[in-house]
């Protein structure tokens, strides 16, 4: 079984992923997110399912969730825009754009990440980086500091096998291997970064973690370029 850190990963180098966001509900980490523009964070739509009565905010510039850090700043959310086709009971279109109350103060620890606009599958076997503050072991422990893991992209045909996700992986989704190393609860909405470019967003389905027959599922941002552009415009 994995030794913890995301699942099977390790603690990230502090502030080396300046695009990384923690989407928070009532002051506690809820989901990951990624800064895609000065005033916009991309996350997963399902993250806000339980947030109806709570205060949603976005933490930028953080490594530790609890410790004071000069670069850390918590932003209120002006507007939450889930993808119009997202639904509670499916993993499809699981994207959310959060408009910050003001433009983020950019610096070495806070910077938007370029995102993929060319709608072409990432080559299977490509190593991609996923980071988050999600649970780090099968007991369910949540870390205080940002964790990350490198995962190989898995081809869609394998991911769609009956023994795996049984046809649920559309062309707008992609998979990464999940053999002991994996994203898990609390990583939803976070970035899958391949070659320095945002390719995917961790979906927020209640999938078993760390089981090689249940690969991680990620929403392909390139497939939603038109929608992202229309919201950010």
């Amino acid at each position: 079984p994995p030794r913890g850190r995301i699942l099977g990963g390790r603690e990230a180098e502090a502030h080396a992923r300046p695009y990384m966001a923690s989407v928070q509900l009532n002051g506690a980490h809820l989901c990951g997110g990624v800064l895609v523009a000065e005033q916009w964070v991309l996350s997963a739509a399902h993250c806000l399912e339980d947030a109806a009565d709570g205060k949603v905010q976005v933490l930028l510039g953080a490594h530790s969730l609890s410790q004071p850090e000069p670069s850390k700043r918590l932003y209120d959310v002006l507007r939450a825009v889930p993808h119009p086709d997202s639904q509670p009971d499916t993993i499809d279109h699981d994207l959310l754009l959060l408009q910050l109350s003001e433009k983020a103060t950019l610096g070495p620890a806070v910077r938007p990440l370029p995102w993929q606009r060319v709608d072409r599958d990432v080559a299977p076997g490509t190593l991609c980086d996923v980071a988050g503050w999600g649970i780090v072991n099968h007991a369910g422990r949540r870390p205080d500091s940002l964790q990350h893991v490198l995962l190989p992209v898995l081809d869609r045909a394998t991911c769609n096998r009956r023994t795996h996700h049984d046809g649920a992986i559309t062309e707008r989704l992609m998979c990464a291997e999940s053999n002991r190393r994996d994203s898990c609860k609390g990583d939803s909405g976070g970035p899958l970064v391949c070659g320095g470019v945002l390719e995917g967003v961790v979906t927020s389905g209640s999938r078993v973690c760390g089981n090689r027959k249940k690969p991680g599922i990620y929403t392909r941002v390139a497939s939603y370029a038109a929608w992202i552009d229309s919201v950010l415009a």
């Epitope: 007991a139 369910g140 422990r141 078993v208």
Partner: antibody, heavy 113, light 106 residues
């Protein structure tokens, strides 16, 4: 602040069943795993099993399979432990835990005729 | 299943004294948790992932080890440390606890 409030002590007859509850506050149970552990003086601490409240998936120690059933109600942020066909061997304190980190105060179950 | 043996079963220490207790597994485990249980109370997490201090735990507590041998050390015993200490592994199902080390104050 994370808190786990367990139901009160139970005195039950052999052969009966009992359902213990554990209501969480300060966090959403869907965002972690919830566990139950038993403690008897002669057997020490024993992990019974866990549940992923987001989907109901459970995992048990084989020795508690058939004896214990763990369920969750996400609407009330509560997890349950049902113990069936009770014998004196099941007399113990039962704890619920969040992520094997935060423990409830424990529920004492006494099986006696 | 992984069987954890704690030693000694009972020990005592004077205030200010260094205390070390061990937890041996019958097969290799990847990480260890340690809990403290004071009389009449629920257990409390002290150490996770072998050597990391849980929130609010005094720095006089430390954990170390790998493979089949793990230990918990208290650098300077204090009266409030009188308790029973349990190790626990989550490497292999079913997750198991050691039988405990009861630490008394002299």
């Amino acid at each position: 602040e994370v808190q786990l409030q367990q139901s009160g002590a139970e005195l039950v007859k052999p052969g009966a069943s009992v359902r213990l509850s554990c209501t969480a506050s300060g966090f959403n149970i869907k965002h972690t795993y919830m566990h139950w552990v038993s403690q008897r003086p002669e057997r020490g601490l024993e992990w019974i099993g866990k549940i992923d409240p987001a989907n109901g998936n459970t995992k048990y120690d084989p020795k508690f399979q058939g004896k214990a059933t763990i369920t969750a109600d996400t609407s009330s942020n509560t997890v349950y432990l049902q113990l069936s066909s009770l014998t004196s061997e099941d007399t113990a304190v039962y704890y619920c835990l969040n992520a094997m980190e935060y423990w409830g105060q424990g529920t004492s179950v006494t099986v006696s005729s | 299943q992984s069987v954890l043996t704690q030693s000694p079963a009972i020990m005592s220490a004077s205030p200010g004294e260094k205390v070390t207790m061990t937890c041996s597994a019958n097969s290799s485990v990847s990480d260890m948790y340690w809990y403290q249980q004071r009389p009449g109370s629920s257990p409390r997490l002290l150490i996770y992932d072998t050597s990391n201090l849980a929130s609010g735990v005094p720095v006089r507590f430390s954990g170390s080890g790998s493979g089949t041998s793990y230990s918990l050390t208290i650098s300077r015993m204090e009266a409030e440390d009188a308790a029973t200490y349990y190790c626990q592994q989550w490497s292999t199902y079913p997750w198991t606890f050691g039988g405990g080390t009861k630490l008394e104050i002299k």
